[in-house]
Interface confidence: low
Amino acid sequence: GELETSDVVTVVLGQDAKLPCFYRGDSGEQVGQVAWARADAGEGAQELALLHSKYGLHVSPAYEGRVEQPPPPRNPLDGSVLLRNAVQADEGEYECRVSTFPAGSFQARLRLRVLVPPLPSLNPGPALEEGQGLTLAASCTAEGSPAPSVTWDTEVKGTTSSRSFKHSRSAAVTSEFHLVPSRSMNGQPLTCVVSHPGLLQDQRITHILHVSFLAEASVRGLEDQNLWHVGREGAMLKCLSEGQPPPSYNWTRLDGPLPSGVRVDGDTLGFPPLTTEHSGIYVCHVSNEFSSRDSQVTVDVLDPQEDSGKQVDLVSAS
């Protein structure tokens, strides 16, 4: 006869490990007992359990409550056992020794591999600002056994660098993602992807990029100067800019205080019915935590009566 087992049994931390050992014998052969032992070099052989044909399963004190026989129906030639709730310390070599009648003893070894799935963490780098050089966007660390794979999934252009630290029973892998910050990266996802044989699927942690910037400011509303005449209602100036964080707006008049009746509503400056008093230089001041910008425009309110008066004078003068 011969023993049938596996070279390697792989389980995830916390799962039950089936340690197979089946005696394929000739007709009439019987299995008297199956002794399981831990057989790591350096640790010395350590009894795990004894499966006896007459009085059943005996488990050594160190494994009490953790070793069981597979559920029925059971073949009397099957010496397999279940190791409950595998922990990393269970990883190593195991030996099953089968005593048969009349063929004698047989033994086989297998290796138990306990996968410790990683618990990944993503740490954003320092605040990103437009104009910086190559900057750390984020680092991702995962520790497990065996060493996990850490990669990045993103449409953002950047460079990655990885380093690995071996611990006594695991390995920690850290990958860093560096980029040159630009405003187009704002809101873009940067995803850390951790792969490991102990995971059913890759673990993904997503970080949304935030790049501080402030665009040049400009003022809209003066495209047609002819619209800015005395008596016109609903005239307004709008300050245009964009930034991250979103900027705040402030309006001032360079050549004096804002005229009464002029309303400031965020980026918009609203005028009451226009008078010549509204002529002047207006400044939009845009700022966020990153920077500040100014844009100024000259408003010249036309008075049709003045214009027509001048024309009459000119006519009479001729």
């Epitope: 640790e43 010395g44 709730n85 618990l119 963490s121 520790e143 056994s145 006594s168 695991s170």
Partner: antibody, heavy 118, light 109 residues
């Protein structure tokens, strides 16, 4: 910076239960195992068990099997250790300690004194 | 279960070298970690994985491990080193953390 802040001192009667909390901050809570260790007055350190904050799986010291329960709340980054059927010899300072895959403890809580007295 | 044995006390004069031992069956095949504990305070990791030092721990603290004995060595001992010291291992056969009984280091003078 990494901090483990434990709940305050407790006085309990024999036979009662005690539940000690340990709030973690300054690191990714689910990235590290948490252990509980106790120390009776004038005595050495005694390991009680370990919990995986990510999945909640636990391993308890054989001495405390059946009497200790370790749980966690990931929403508040807090682990709990409940010890039941208290006796006078359970009077001790109970520590939570952050571990690296069950090998060594790099950060400890300040300790919680549990006094069991009738 | 696995047992770690430490001497109850070690005395040393300031400036001298203190050696604290931790005995265990074939302890050289395990990773040993050392903690310092001052009265009324939580333990502090001073050496891990036999001989590595956490950041912030002076180079005066070192460790070794072979055969049946692990040793914590504190060179140029200072008064502030007076404390209890504990060794610790992970016993893979029982899946348990095991601490030594502790050693009280007394700095003379």
């Amino acid at each position: 910076q990494v901090q483990l802040v434990q709940s305050g001192a407790e006085v309990k009667k024999p036979g009662a239960s005690v539940k000690v909390s340990c709030k973690a901050s300054g690191y990714t809570f689910t990235g590290y195992y948490m252990h509980w260790v106790r120390q009776a007055p004038g005595q050495g350190l005694e390991w009680m068990g370990i919990i995986n904050p990510s999945g909640g799986s636990t391993t308890y010291a054989q001495k405390f099997q059946g009497r200790v329960t370790m749980t966690r709340d990931t929403s508040t980054s807090t682990v709990y250790m409940e010890l039941s059927s208290l006796r006078s010899e359970d009077t001790a300072v109970y520590y939570c300690a952050r571990g690296r895959l069950g090998t060594y403890f790099d950060y400890w809580g300040q300790g919680t004194l549990v006094t069991v007295s009738s | 279960s696995y047992v770690l044995t430490q001497p109850p006390s070690v005395s040393v004069a300031p400036g001298q070298t203190a050696r604290i031992t931790c005995g265990g069956n074939n302890i050289g095949s395990k990773s040993v970690h050392w903690y310092q504990q001052k009265p009324g305070q939580a333990p502090v990791l001073v050496v891990y994985d036999d001989s590595d030092r956490p950041s912030g721990i002076p180079e005066r603290f070192s460790g070794s491990n072979s055969g049946n004995t692990a040793t914590l060595t504190i060179s140029r001992v200072e008064a502030g080193d007076e404390a209890d010291y504990y060794c610790q291992v992970w016993d893979r056969s029982s899946d348990q953390v095991v601490f030594g009984g502790g050693t009280k280091l007394t700095v003379l003078g």
